[in-house]
Interface confidence: low
């Protein structure tokens, strides 16, 4: 792992990448897509201890004000940074139709 | 109120946006920051529940594996979807300058 | 419609407590946090805090933190705000008003309010 | 606490005039303010929210602008029921506070 990217809590257990095998019924998706039938979803998962991945001033305020205030401000957390785009073939009344949907599955993940 | 906003949980508990006051010192800012000596710090905080202020396709999928696999996928998380500019006065070597970050308080807030 | 209706005109002596009503109809009651405020002529409007109706949740201003106490009973769908320790500068129209779902400290409907006066 | 002084306190005009009240803050709010009005005898109603957003009912002769510290109410086109007391709120944290008011009165 970069110097970085070091997680305090123990190996895998900081915010990064997973990736979720999930079918259109767990996605709620049946009725509107045909393909693919099954997703694997990658999405940002873990822990977000102090400043470890810290996405900007704000994610360092949000730290520093959580140590402070634990029941108040909560600590900041995992969510996408950047996201892959990914094509569905869709059931429209006339047939099927293509459509890319650029902000479905996390590229990279950092703390917020 | 809209109705896309309606939170479930009660008023005031879903993700929106909170202001702290916060000093210097509470930041860590004391040794590098002179003015404002007080910061009302915007952020985000509160519950994400199902679709309520969905940033994007990702944070509907993620609702519907939290709802699947809640030990393994975590809810959506409460963050910025904007910010606002905040100036400040900084020590220099050299005396002061004023440093413009746009990254600081957010402006507004959605599910992630 | 939203309505919010206040009870009457009280008339307290100074280190007395007034408990003002403010009944809620229109709208689900848990729905919306329940705010208060006051009007007098010499400090104008002011904020005493806010209540969350659901789990009863309160947000005082640090000026009345210590006298103020606000409450409700959703079984009545009515709101209450107890000033305890009255002074003559208490003397003012208290307002009990919603406050918009995603804004804190927005009030959307008021009371009609209840006169105070605070005299010996 | 936040500050809000708004100007003029008091001002005179015709049906029909254009008219706008102004409000500073004491420090940066954004657009986290909100414009009431408010008659004798009655309950402040609530005009325009996040310095120009039009609350429901209200007609489109009220507008509301600026951001940070500096703010406006104008009304285009001044009504007979238009005359009463402006004030301007923050909403920018705990605890929200208030304009003194401008009283608008027939000239």
């Known amino acids: 792992a970069r110097n970085g990217d070091d997680c305090p809590l123990g190996p895998g257990r900081c915010c990064r990448l997973h990736t979720v095998r999930a079918s259109l019924e767990d996605l709620g998706w049946a009725d509107w897509v045909l393909s693919p039938r099954e997703v694997q979803v990658t999405m940002c998962i873990g822990a977000c201890p102090s400043q470890f991945r810290a996405a900007n001033m704000h994610a360092q305020i949000k730290t520093s004000l959580h140590r402070l205030k634990p029941d108040t401000v909560p600590a900041p957390c995992c969510v996408p940074a950047s996201y892959n785009p990914m094509v569905l073939i869709q059931k429209t009344d006339t047939g099927v139709s293509l459509q890319t949907y650029d902000d479905l599955l996390a590229k990279d993940c950092h703390c917020i | 109120a809209r109705n896309g906003d309606d939170c479930p949980l009660g008023p005031g508990r879903c993700c929106r946006l909170h202001t702290v006051r916060a000093s210097l010192e509470d930041l860590g800012w004391a040794d590098w920051v002179l003015s404002p000596r007080e910061v009302q710090v915007t952020m985000c905080i509160g519950a994400c529940p199902s679709q309520f202020r969905a940033a994007n396709m990702h944070a509907q999928i993620k609702t519907s594996l939290h709802r699947l696999k809640p030990d393994t996928v975590p809810a959506p998380c409460c963050v910025p979807a904007s910010y606002n500019p905040m100036v400040l006065i900084q020590k220099t070597d050299t005396g002061v300058s004023l440093q413009t970050y746009d990254d600081l308080l957010a402006k507004d807030c959605h599910c992630i | 419609q939203v309505q919010l209706v206040q009870s009457g005109s009280e008339l307290k002596k100074p280190g007395a407590s007034v408990k003002v009503s403010c009944k809620a109809s229109g709208y689900t009651f848990t729905d919306y946090n329940m705010d208060w405020i006051r009007q007098s002529p010499g400090k104008g409007l002011e904020w005493i805090g806010d209540i969350n109706p659901n789990q009863g949740g309160t947000f005082y201003n640090q000026k009345f933190k210590d006298r103020a106490t606000l409450t409700v009973d959703k079984s009545t769908s009515t709101a209450y705000m107890e000033l305890r320790s009255l002074r003559s500068d208490d003397t003012a129209v208290y307002y009990c008003?919603?406050?918009?779902?995603?804004?804190?400290?927005?009030?959307?409907?008021w009371g009609q309010g209840t006169t105070v006066t605070v005299s010996s | 606490d936040i500050q809000m002084t708004q100007s003029p306190s008091s001002l005179s005009a015709s049906v029909g005039d254009r008219v706008t009240i102004t409000c500073r803050a004491s420090e940066n709010i954004y657009s986290y303010l909100a414009w009431y009005q408010q008659k004798p005898g009655k309950a402040p109603k609530l005009l325009v929210y996040?310095?120009?957003t039009l609350a429901e009912g209200v007609p489109s002769r009220f507008s509301g602008s600026g951001s940070g510290i500096d703010f406006t109410l104008t009304i285009s086109s001044l009504q007979p029921e238009d005359f009463a007391t402006y004030y301007c709120?923050?909403?920018?944290?705990?605890?929200?506070?208030f304009g003194q008011g401008t009283k608008l009165e027939i000239k």
């Open positions: 709120q923050h909403q920018y944290g705990s605890p929200p506070t």
């Open positions: 008003a919603r406050e918009e779902k995603l804004y804190f400290g927005l009030m959307d409907y």
């Open positions: 996040n310095a120009k």
